[in-house]
């Protein structure tokens, strides 16, 4: 049952004399393993013998032996799947049909394969895409229906006979479906490749030429143009004529339209290959090109730069940067349309020529206020001198200059005055917008650069102001030099260092902390009485009568200041002692008599002693001696002694007379 045999292999295999052929082949014999295989060349079925006749190229026997003459042909298969064959070398007369006679235990099959062997190596075949456009990548394919393991070959690409630089990718196929060798080349053709010959060359392993295929490239491209100009340097003066010609060096397909462009914009009514410009003006300076189109698109020539030369136009000045800050750098640029470019420049500041400045740019490394003003320039080239344009204004900004704090008051300023100060400045750009004052925050803040100090203090010494725009400039501080009466006047005892005793030498000093002006006069007074006009008040020998309340006054041209009253205390021993008697120095017996020891002492008497007419001290120590009832025997002279921390003093004798009462006399 023939339906049991299934074969897969290429239908036809190609080779050439001396090469080899490799026949990939698979089969299935479903009833069992292959027992016999014969490879016939052009087999013919003999009906009489019911067998195939023909040249036997290969025969396998049951015992597996292969005759030695069959070495050229090899069966590389097996008993159930593989039926691959190799013929090496292959000859021209091997062309025709190969018959694979297969036999299993119960079945037989003849499988036919076509073999085409040429006398010489056949050429490969180049495949091109349907259309090739310039600069678009295409893949060129070179295909050869041949591949054999025993006969290595290579495919090489040539352009106009020269090997191509691009790397080709070669692949081979030896499968039951197909047998081939293929080379693929990726390539971006340029318009210049149009009409060029591309060759795919078949070579053996040693690089020996075997065969080739060639094609002519048909590269579609936009028109390629050349522009010619008269005069050739394209430099003319106003009023001259210019001719430009456009030549098409290549176009595929043929061109359809022509136009001219200036600075990228199409020129109206210029549709021929020649452009004539008569009596040119400077406005016609620019970049010219011609444009020719075909079905691929427009092609443009290189640009011709037409220069119409003219004298410089009125110039303008560009300043980098205005306003400028004093001390910064500034650059001025003179801009003037001219052809050729100006070779010389003349610069003006406020209408006056700036000496030594002949360049297009003027650089001032350190701007000062006097640099402000109008800058203009004049440009000059070989055709003439331009006009001076309107110029540009340089604004130089700087902090306020020469700031001074000015005292508006008539001098001198006295403590308590209202002082007015103004903050003045010489110049400022931009304008002064505010003022600041030192000391900070001491007074009501002024507004328009005038500071009013109400009731100025003696201690307000120095003031400074600043005028501010974008920056603050401080004036040097000014001294108010406030004049005031002497301050902190007080009496100070210089000597003695300890307490004052009667008879001491005493010096009092009139002190004050400060005075402005410094020239002062002193006055000492006691109880409204003037004592002296020196800073010191001296007592050679102080007496208790000098004690009391002293004040000193210090005055200057502004006023006078008094000290607090200062009490001078003189210490002395008890003096002026006397004994006084109450009710009198004659007292009737039985009545009461009081003797008092009166004295003048500083400090007061602390201790009293009483004596009788016999200078006998009495046992009484208080200021008063009370006799009650008084007796006639108490009559006599008494005296007292007073003691304080300084010393003692005694009184003179005072006589007490005690007389008899009427009762006593009556009894007598």
């Amino acid at each position: 049952d023939s339906s049991k045999w299934v074969f897969e292999h290429p239908e036809t295999l190609y080779a050439w004399e001396g090469a080899c052929v490799w026949i990939p082949c698979t089969y299935r014999a479903l009833d069992g393993d292959l027992e016999s295989f014969i490879l016939f060349h052009n087999p013919e079925y003999n009906k009489n013998t019911s067998k195939f006749d023909g040249t036997r190229l290969y025969e396998s026997t049951k015992d597996g032996k292969v005759p030695s003459e069959q070495k050229r042909v090899q069966f590389l298969g097996d008993k159930n799947k593989n039926c691959t064959l190799s013929i090496h070398p292959v000859h021209l007369n091997d062309s025709g049909q190969l018959g694979l006679r297969m036999e299993s235990k119960t079945e037989k099959w003849m499988e036919r394969i076509h073999l085409n062997v040429s006398e010489r190596p056949f050429p490969p075949h180049i495949q091109l895409p349907p259309e090739i456009q310039e600069s678009q990548e295409v893949t060129l394919t070179c295909l050869l229906n041949f591949s054999c393991y025993g006969y290595p070959i290579q495919l090489q690409w040539l352009l106009e006979g020269v090997p191509m630089r691009q790397a080709a990718v070669t692949s081979t196929s030896l499968t039951i479906k197909s047998v081939f060798t293929r080379s693929e080349l990726k390539f971006s053709p340029q318009w210049s490749h149009h009409g060029k010959i591309v060759t795919c060359q078949l070579q053996d392993a040693d690089g020996k030429f075997l065969s080739n295929d060639t094609v002519q490239l048909n590269v579609k491209h936009t028109p390629k143009l050349e522009i010619k100009v008269t005069p050739s340097d394209a430099i003319v003066r106003e009023g001259d004529s210019v001719t430009m010609t456009c030549e098409v060096s290549s176009s595929n397909p043929e061109y359809t339209t022509v136009s001219w462009l200036k600075d990228g914009t199409s020129l109206k009514k210029q549709n021929t290959f020649t452009l004539n410009l008569r009596e040119v003006t400077k406005d016609q300076s620019g970049k010219y090109c011609c444009q020719v189109s075909n079905d691929v698109g427009p092609g443009r020539s290189e640009e011709v730069f037409l220069q119409v030369q003219y004298a410089p136009e009125p110039s303008t000045v560009q300043i980098l940067h205005s306003p400028a800050v004093e001390g910064s750098q500034v650059e001025f640029l003179c801009m003037s349309l001219a052809n050729p470019l100006p070779t010389n420049y003349t610069w003006y500041h406020n209408g006056k020529e700036m000496q030594g400045r002949t360049e297009e740019k003027v650089h001032i490394p350190k701007i000062l206020p006097w640099h402000a003003g109008t800058y203009s320039c004049v440009a000059e080239n070989i055709l003439g001198t331009g006009q001076r344009g309107p110029g540009a204004e340089l604004d130089v900004q700087y902090p306020p200059k020469k700031v001074t704090t000015v005292i508006q008051n008539p001098m001198p300023i006295r403590e308590g005055d209202t002082v007015t100060l103004s903050c003045n400045y010489n110049s400022s750009n931009p304008s002064v917008t505010r003022y600041e004052w030192k000391p900070h925050g001491a007074w009501e803040e002024p507004s328009l650069g005038v500071l009013k100090i109400q009731n100025v203090g003696w201690d307000n010494t120095t003031i400074a102001c600043a005028a501010c725009n974008s920056w603050c400039s401080w004036a040097s501080p000014v001294a108010l030099n406030v004049q005031y009466a002497p301050r902190d006047v007080r009496v100070r005892k210089i000597k003695p260092l300890s307490e004052i005793h009667s008879g001491n030498s005493v010096s009092l000093q009139c002190d004050f902390s400060s005075s402005h002006p410094k020239e002062v006069q002193f006055f000492w007074e006691k109880n409204g009485r003037l004592l002296g006009k020196e800073s010191q008040l001296n007592f050679d020998s102080i007496s208790p009568e000098d004690a009391g309340s002293y004040s000193c006054w210090v005055n200057n041209s502004i006023g006078q200041t008094a000290s607090k009253a200062w009490t001078l205390e003189v210490l002395y021993a008890p003096r002026r002692l006397r004994v006084s008697m109450s009710p009198g120095d004659q007292v009737m017996e039985g009545k009461s008599a009081t003797l008092t020891c009166e004295s003048d002492a500083n400090p007061p008497v602390s201790h009293y002693t009483w004596f009788d007419w016999n200078n006998q001290s009495l046992p009484y120590h208080s200021q008063k001696l009370r006799l009650e009832p008084v007796k006639v025997q108490h009559s006599g002279a008494y005296w007292c002694q007073g003691t304080n921390s300084v010393g003692k003093g005694r009184s003179p004798l005072s006589t007490l007379t005690v007389y008899y009462s009427p009762e006593t006399i009556g009894r007598r």
Epitope: K438, P439, H440, T461
Partner: antibody, heavy 115, light 107 residues
Framework: QVQLQQPGAELVKPGTSVKLSCKAS?????SYWINWVKLRPGQGLEW???????????NYNEKFKSKATLTVDTSSTTAYMQLSSLASEDSALYYC????????WGQGTTLTVSS | DIQMTQSPASLSASVGETVTITCRAS??????LAWYQQKQGKSPQLLVY???TLADGVPSRFSGSGSGTQYSLTINSLQPEDFGSYYC?????????FGAGTKLELK
């Protein structure tokens, strides 16, 4: 008599802002600078800046320029200090005080910055 | 900016003693210096301004002196209520700056 009144304390979270107030009375508010002073334990007094209510002019200690913003409301005779992007180091006692020599002081506001 | 350097940082003294605190400015402040006293938990209080003028109500035992860059505060016959912290501050220009302070303690 001259008085500057400040709230006793403010508690705020880190990263937030706070506006401290200082209410003035007993004098012409627009005629004297209002100063703000910071006191941190063991760190002494630090001047933050001042504002002149009559014009709104301000001066700042460079250290506090991006931290404090001083404003006034003359109608209510109140000065304000806004502190932004608060962090723990902004926790302190903040005083307002009058004039260049600080003749009258508020009682101070204790600001605590804590999460 | 003008820096103020105050010394000493701390000082121990007894009632009745005389003490002096000094302040040095990094530039001439033209006598525009103030002295403050601060007690624990209280606002600072102005004692002296313009270097030597006593503020209203300040006892005469306090006195200020100095000029240019060197200034001092003297307290004669210390009283119990004088103990606390003292600060100097200039107001010649902005920024106003304070001294670091002097802590006056009872010995």
């Amino acid at each position: 008599q001259v008085q500057l009144q400040q709230p006793g304390a403010e508690l705020v979270k880190p990263g937030t802002s706070v506006k401290l107030s200082c209410k003035a009375s007993g004098y012409n508010f627009t005629s004297y600078w209002i100063n703000w002073v910071k006191l941190r334990p063991g760190q002494g007094l630090e001047w933050i800046g001042d504002i002149y209510p009559g014009s709104g002019n301000t001066n700042y200690n460079e250290k506090f320029k991006s931290k404090a913003t001083l404003t006034v409301d003359t109608s209510s005779t109140t000065a304000y200090m806004q502190l932004s992007s608060l962090a723990s180091e902004d926790s302190a006692l903040y005083y307002c005080a009058r004039r260049g020599y600080l003749d009258y002081w508020g009682q101070g506001t204790t600001l605590t910055v804590s999460s | 900016d003008i820096q103020m350097t105050q010394s000493p940082a701390s000082l121990s003294a007894s009632v009745g003693e005389t003490v002096t605190i000094t302040c040095r400015a990094s530039g001439n402040i033209h006598n525009y210096l103030a002295w403050y006293q601060q007690k624990q938990g209280k606002s600072p209080q102005l004692l002296v301004y313009n270097a030597k003028t006593l503020a209203d109500g300040v006892p005469s035992r306090f006195s200020g002196s100095g000029s240019g860059t060197q200034y001092s505060l003297t307290i004669n016959s210390l009283q119990p209520e004088d103990f606390g912290s003292y600060y100097c501050q200039h107001f010649w220009s902005t920024p106003l700056t304070f001294g670091a302070g002097t802590k006056l303690e009872l010995k």
